[in-house]
Interface confidence: medium
């Protein structure tokens, strides 16, 4: 079920682009969109266990919606309260960077981080 | 996915088993053989950079018989790239460590990865 484009990683029927270049959250979002993908939306914290020993943090597709007063993924679905137990302490003006060992932190969206794009192959 | 075993990753026409267990170099070699694959070989610099993003450290299929012998790959070819700490006579197996190739004691317990080409 997996046939990923060049430079993308295939794992469990998803394709991931793992950047080594640092971008702002918005720049990262646009770069993923230009590759017909979106910033990483996590199903669970094991999703990237193939790189769980990485020490880097990566922008993911999570942002705070004032309208819904909730953290939402790019597709509009809400963040599960079980994914990041510390999410209530996140500054709602910030964006979320994720480390594949399961940690997340909030940072200014204008900060530059690496990013991960995801394409689902069904 | 595709032609790779379940729980392996695909990248650039190869399948990779990203191990989390630590083994000696020789144990890693045997573990990969049992998975019908080879201990991680790095064919080019771009592959090395990719693997360094995925995993900070792992054994690679490069070794030497002693510090007086050249570094060779599993198919017996000379390995021409710089391997750090090569002047230490006790370090005769090679490790990928965050974009670097280093020598290490073959009996050390280090994470291993396996690879096979599609």
């Amino acid at each position: 079920c997996c046939s990923c484009q060049e430079k993308w990683v295939g794992y469990r029927c998803n394709c991931y682009f793992i950047s080594s270049e640092q971008k702002t959250w918005n720049e990262s979002r646009h770069l993923c969109a230009s590759q017909k993908s979106s910033l990483l939306q996590l199903q669970n914290t094991d999703e990237l266990d193939f790189m769980s020993s990485s020490q880097q943090f990566y922008w993911i597709g999570l942002s705070y919606s004032e309208e819904h007063t909730a953290w939402l993924w790019e597709n509009g679905s809400a963040l599960s309260q079980y994914l990041f137990p510390s999410f209530e302490t996140f500054n709602t003006k910030n964006c979320i960077a994720y480390n594949p060992n399961g940690n997340a932190l909030d940072e200014s969206c204008e900060d530059k981080n690496r990013y991960i794009c995801k394409q689902q192959l069904i | 996915c595709g032609h790779c075993p379940e729980e392996w990753i695909t990248y650039s026409n190869s399948c990779y088993y990203i191990g989390k267990e630590r083994r000696t170099w020789e144990e890693s070699l045997l573990a990969c053989t049992s998975k019908n694959s080879s201990l991680l070989s790095i064919d080019n610099e771009e592959e090395m950079k990719f693997l360094s993003i995925i995993s900070p450290s792992s054994w690679i299929g490069v070794f030497r018989n002693s510090s007086h012998h050249p570094w060779v790959t599993m198919n017996g070819l000379a390995f021409k790239h710089e391997i750090k700490d090569s002047d230490n006579a006790e370090l005769n197996c090679a490790v990928l460590q965050v974009n670097r190739l280093k020598s290490a004691q073959c009996g050390s317990s280090i994470i291993y990865h396996c690879k096979h080409k599609l």
């Epitope: 430079k7 080594s20 270049e21 640092q22 | 950079k49 360094s52 965050v98 670097r100």
Partner: antibody
Framework: EVQLVESGGGLVKPGGSLRLSCAAS????????MNWVRQAPGKGLEWVSA????????YYADSVKGRFTISRDNAKNSLYLQMNSLRAEDTAVYYC???????????WGQGTLVTVSS | AIQLTQSPSSLSASVGDRVTITCRAS??????LAWYQQKPGKAPKLLIY???SLKSGVPSRFSGSGSGTDFTLTISSLQPEDFATYYC?????????FGQGTRLEIK
């Protein structure tokens, strides 16, 4: 002996274009990432652009993105930097530099001076 | 981009002195730091990579240390040929960045 020789620098008007070349010898050019680094008169070093061994990965500094294009011809052992829409602040000595499989810049050329002035 | 701040910007020292130059990164870069020496009119020369690994052929009086955000280049006993400008560089992620340089002058 590793050698990198830059050429193509000179005086150009703002808005103009220039193409720098870097001729490599003494090593397997196609195995190495290459970079351009510049240094404005009396100032520090500024990284400009990088290209991986097979041109799969290309990176630019924000200050040149959209104006400069890095490329390479492995058959000719040559690295290039196409510079368009040049500005006064692009005035600098431009160096090409080699990476050794993820090591930082272990060999540099002697540099070529680019002057952007009306 | 990751910013590197070197200190001091310049320093005067004598032959035989022990000299230390520091480099601070705006975010953690593990040990992905290099040090270069540059003399007027010449290309930079790699001294240290991986924060503490000495490039072959570089005199052992040069040493590097540090990890994360704080790094140090030490010259244990200055020689006349060591008077130059020194730069740190991070290669943890793109864009690659250099420190602003430290000019080492004869006292």
């Amino acid at each position: 002996e590793v050698q990198l020789v830059e050429s193509g620098g000179g005086l150009v008007k703002p808005g103009g274009s220039l193409r720098l070349s870097c001729a490599a010898s003494g090593f397997t050019f196609s195995s190495h990432s290459m970079n351009w680094v510049r240094q404005a008169p009396g100032k520090g070093l500024e990284w400009v652009s990088a290209i991986s061994s097979s041109s799969s990965y290309i990176y630019y500094a924000d200050s040149v993105k959209g104006r400069f294009t890095i490329s390479r011809d492995n058959a000719k052992n040559s690295l290039y930097l196409q510079m368009n829409s040049l500005r006064a602040e692009d005035t600098a000595v431009y160096y090409c530099a080699r990476e050794e499989w993820g090591l930082p810049f272990d060999y540099w050329g002697q540099g070529t001076l680019v002057t952007v002035s009306s | 981009a990751i910013q590197l701040t070197q200190s001091p910007s310049s320093l005067s020292a004598s032959v035989g002195d022990r000299v230390t130059i520091t480099c601070r990164a705006s975010q953690g870069i593990s040990s992905a730091l290099a040090w270069y020496q540059q003399k007027p009119g010449k290309a930079p020369k790699l001294l240290i990579y991986d924060a503490s690994s000495l490039k072959s052929g570089v005199p052992s009086r040069f040493s590097g240390s540090g990890s994360g955000t704080d790094f140090t280049l030490t010259i244990s006993s200055l020689q006349p040929e060591d008077f130059a400008t020194y730069y740190c560089q991070q290669f943890n992620s793109y864009p690659l960045t250099f420190g602003q340089g430290t000019r080492l002058e004869i006292k």
